[in-house]
């Protein structure tokens, strides 16, 4: 529980005044206020809207409320020469063409500045050639297109369906494929569940509807011009061809009413199995290239956009702290939006606003957190979380030795069915104490806590009775803190049911159609589950910020090593005969787990008998509690990813949104039977075991007696 | 406050060139452009080109290229409109307007007082 | 270049008075459309922008709509400090143009 000693407030002034503060109508009228014109990263639209956020902040009573700025590389299309896509015949004329815009939805034709469907940072270029259908275009997709099927994609133009993994991903597998330009496109069987009609009336995708995006690879460099450098006025800035994490080709997104028109003249190979074909009336044949009769049409990009040094604002809030105002506990979430946001980030920072309203009602009335509290709305975070990024690069000297923990709050759902959370081990014991003291939304759950619905709609897949809690990946604000800087993370929002809805996202994910409306009419009428996720994200801030002892349980953390040194060692031994030639052993590994373990529970001893009252002994205590995330930070950072620096996890190398477990052992394994030189790839494996093995020991250090 | 405060009123020859100069104060220089626009007596205005200062990129109306320049000095937050090859019909109130440096922007918001300048002979 | 065609050029009104004017595009400028008010001797200000939006300070007697290309500035009840000249600005595309103006007169 809460505890209240050393910030002199009163009784009143505890969890659950800060809960009962929160509402859910304020939350629709915050979201319907932030999505009636569109707010995309470096437009005046967001600047109007990041003055107002700071506007209102301060009236809410925070202490401070500033804008960072940072001049940071975005990417728009032409106004004056649009992109598109082409079939053109044998002698060069276009017989068809992509839309160049999507049908507006019902209420906003007289809407201006909707950016068209673009890639982000796609490069200009107008490549022709025949087509090859590449499915999700994941590793594994290539590797049974070149290796099973034999088929080359060089100097092809290559058509992949949205889902599963980051599109960025996507480009960068294409790019090593050799292909000359990529058709992102969204299939009705990822993005169109069956039974729902498509917006405006239901909430599914319709033909006409494209998914924006940005399609960087930049491994948490944050703007591709400053990489680890804050894109301040006097920066240094690379030169494009230097930029980190450009695509090479160019790439632009389509609906699937266009989509059927390229795939359904495909010939060539037939789908190699069933999981390669979509919901379309088409073949899904992979080609290269048109069947018989079409046999000489080609495809034609036509790609105008540029890269441009684009001005962006974070708006940064403080609501300082009583007792330990050099301890940041920090709420971020992102402005800016592809269009109208309803969802995306809106609906997270509706909430973050009514948090920030209710913290403000609390202060105003006397009280103050234990801990300072910052809030922050971030900008360009579609473009490849700049925002954040760059201001933890300013600010780097700072979070690393005051930075507590950091909630993230883009999207508070893609879906209403039950609760979804991702954060580091540290906070499973606060999440789950948390949602026991929360009412359940949920349909046939009245009178229920939230913990017991969670629970039973998504069951942990290790341990009953409880609710699954995933790993932290990328995708989202909470990158730089987590993986480059070790600040203990989560992230908590409202998800679908994932056994039913095999779809990838939501549906109308960065559409036009990814309004106010959607949300109102088909996600979350009453605004209950929006209300659920500020209680959840705000209960974790007042919690993190408030309670004398940090609410983080080293023992969790303990638990989960134990389980990945287990995963990675199994993946190991699937090549057992090369284990024993090279020698690659993971008892170190084992043994500092185990270490850890032992230390982990010593502390926890500790932590229960220590005397509170002593300050110099609890800020001991709290320091290392708060030290532990940092303490699996790797300087050296991963092989060619000096910014994902956590040795634990850090965002799979084949899918920017899954986190993966000791990242640096998983990678030198992947493929390891294909690698030309074994005994240097084995070599690899060995050191990536011996710096997972001395970070965790390391670790485990950090929490032993300090003398 | 915002504010664009113009220098005064010129008097040209024809064939001569003028520069009016427009101070900003009041917000962040950098973060806007600085838009030109001219009003001859009593006719309507027209828009002559726009600068950038954070990027020193300007745009011009086709119909002054060749013949205005548009610069700006970041250090004291200061733009800069030269025309020249000065014509009777150039006579007129030229105005600087703030606007947004982004991708998307509302156009002018903010304006100078104008520099009222006549070209005589 | 994108032609803006105000009408009417002139009026006479009276305090009280519901006043309409409009600005035809000569082609597509979705919403990038802004109204300005300029009295004798003064500079131009920005009352209106992107059709709809007021601007902070300006009474709410002013509004702005559209129809397609057509754009209208209605002021719902004419006071004695409205007897300006307005302009619409079009800033879709360069160059960016103004209407011909409208020069509101006390009846």
């Known amino acids: 529980k809460s505890s209240n000693e050393a910030t002199n407030i009163t009784p009143k002034h505890n969890m659950k005044a800060f809960l009962d503060e929160l509402k859910a109508e304020n939350i629709k009228k915050f979201l319907y206020n932030f999505t009636q014109i569109p707010h995309l990263a470096g437009t005046e639209q967001n600047f109007q809207l990041a003055k107002q956020i700071q506007s209102q902040w301060k009236e809410f009573g925070l202490d401070s409320v500033e804008l960072a700025h940072y001049d940071v590389l975005l990417s728009y299309p032409n106004k004056t020469h649009p992109n598109y896509i082409s079939i053109i015949n044998e002698d060069g004329n276009e017989i068809f063409n992509t839309s160049l815009f999507e049908p507006p939805p019902p209420g906003y034709e007289n809407v201006s500045d909707i950016v068209p469907p673009f890639s982000a940072f796609s490069p200009q270029g107008m490549p022709e050639g025949d087509l090859v259908y590449v499915n999700y275009a994941r590793t594994e997709d290539f590797f049974k297109l070149e290796r099973d099927m034999k088929i080359n994609c060089s100097g092809k133009i290559v058509i992949a369906r949205y889902g599963k993994v980051f599109r960025g991903n996507k480009v960068k597998n294409a790019q090593l494929a050799g292909a000359k330009g990529v058709i992102l496109y969204s299939d009705p069987a990822d993005y169109f569940a069956p039974g729902v009609k498509s917006y405006p009336d239901g909430w599914n995708l319709p033909g006409g509807g494209v998914q924006r995006g940005n399609i960087l690879n930049l491994n948490g460099a944050g703007d591709p011009l400053t990489p680890g450098y804050p894109a301040n006025e006097y920066a240094y800035r690379r030169g494009i061809a230097e930029a980190v994490g450009l695509p090479s080709i160019p790439v632009h997104p389509i609906g699937y009413y266009d989509a059927q028109k390229l795939l359904e003249k495909m010939g060539g190979s037939a789908p190699p199995d069933s999981s390669w074909r979509g919901s379309l009336k088409v073949p899904y044949n992979v080609g290269p290239g048109f069947t018989g009769n079409f046999s000489t049409q080609k495809v034609k990009m036509h790609i105008h956009s540029t890269n441009e040094v684009t001005r962006i604002y974070n708006v940064i809030g403080t609501l300082r702290g009583a007792v330990e105002p050099d301890r940041y506990v920090i709420l971020g979430g992102h402005r800016d939006s592809w269009v109208f946001g309803g969802i995306d980030p809106q609906s997270g920072a509706a909430v973050v606003h009514e948090i920030v309203r209710s913290f403000g009602t609390l202060k105003k009335e006397g009280w103050r957190p234990r801990r300072t509290i910052l809030f922050a709305s971030w900008d360009a975070e579609e473009f490849g979380l700049l925002g954040s990024t760059e201001w933890a690069e300013e600010n780097s000297r700072l979070l690393q030795e005051r930075g507590v923990a950091y909630i993230n709050a883009d999207s508070s759902i893609e879906g209403n069915y039950t609760l979804r959370v991702d954060c580091t081990p540290l906070m499973y014991s606060l999440v789950h104490n948390l949602t026991k003291e929360l009412k359940s939304p949920d349909e046939g759950f009245e009178g229920k806590s939230l913990y017991e619905s969670w629970t039973k709609k998504s069951p942990s897949p290790e341990f009953s009775g409880m609710p699954r809690i995933s790993k932290l990946g990328s995708g989202n604000d909470f990158e730089v803190f987590f993986q480059r800087l070790g600040i203990a993370s989560g992230r908590a929002r409202y998800t679908k049911n994932w056994e039913t809805n095999k779809f990838s996202g939501y549906p109308l994910y960065h559409s036009v159609y990814e309004t106010y409306e959607l949300v109102e009419k088909f996600y979350d009428p009453m605004f209950k589950y929006h209300l659920t996720v500020a209680q959840v994200r705000g209960g974790m801030v007042f919690e993190l910020a408030n309670s004398i002892v940090l609410p983080f349980d080293c023992r969790d953390y303990a638990v989960v090593l134990r389980k990945y040194a287990d995963k990675i060692y199994s993946i190991s031994m699937k090549h057992p005969q090369e284990m024993k030639t090279y020698s690659v052993s993971f008892d170190s590994l084992f043994s500092a787990v185990k270490n850890f373990t032992e230390i982990a529970s010593k502390f926890s001893e500790r932590l229960q008998d220590f005397d509170k009252s002593n300050p110099i002994v609890l800020r001991m205590m709290n320091d290392q509690l708060m030290f532990l995330e940092r303490a699996f930070i790797d300087p050296l950072g991963l092989p060619d990813r000096p910014f994902y620096r956590h040795v634990i996890y850090a965002p799979s190398s084949h899918n920017k949104y899954a986190g993966e477990s000791f990242p640096g052992i998983y990678d030198a394994l992947f493929d390891i039977e294909s690698k030309v030189d074994p005994s240097k790839a084995w070599g690899e494996v060995k050191r990536q075991i011996y710096v997972a093995a001395f970070t965790v020991q390391a670790a485990a250090e950090t929490l032993s007696e300090v003398a | 406050e915002v504010q664009l405060v113009q220098s005064g009123a010129e008097v040209k020859k024809p064939g001569a060139s003028v520069k009016v100069s427009c101070k900003a104060s009041?917000?962040?220089?950098?973060?806007?452009?600085i838009s030109w626009v001219r009003q001859a007596p009593g006719q309507g205005l027209e828009w002559m080109g726009e600068i950038f200062p954070r990027r020193g990129n300007t745009y011009y109306n086709e119909k002054f290229r060749g013949r205005v320049t548009l610069t700006a000095d970041k250090s004291t937050s200061t733009a800069y409109m030269e025309l020249r090859s000065l014509r009777s019909d150039d006579t007129a109130v030229y105005y600087c307007?703030?606007?947004?440096?982004?991708?998307?922007?509302?156009?002018?918001?903010?304006w100078g007082q104008g520099t009222t300048v006549t070209v005589s002979s | 270049d994108i032609q803006m065609t105000q009408s009417p050029s002139s009026l006479s009104a009276s305090v009280g008075d519901r006043v309409t004017i409009t600005c035809r595009a000569s082609?597509?400028?979705?919403?990038?459309l802004n109204w300005l008010q300029q009295k004798p001797g003064k500079a131009p200000k920005r009352l209106i922008y992107?059709?709809?939006s007021l601007d902070s300070g300006v009474p709410s007697r002013f509004s702005g709509s559209r129809s397609g290309t057509d754009f209208t500035l209605t002021i719902s009840s004419l006071q004695p400090e409205d007897f300006a000249t307005y302009y619409c600005l079009q800033y879709a595309s360069s160059p960016y143009t103004f209407g011909g103006g409208t020069k509101v007169e006390i009846k």
């Open positions: 082609q597509d400028i979705g919403s990038s």
């Open positions: 992107a059709t709809s």
């Open positions: 009041g917000y962040t220089f950098t973060s806007y452009g």
């Open positions: 307007a703030r606007v947004f440096d982004g991708y998307y922007n509302y156009a002018m918001d903010y």
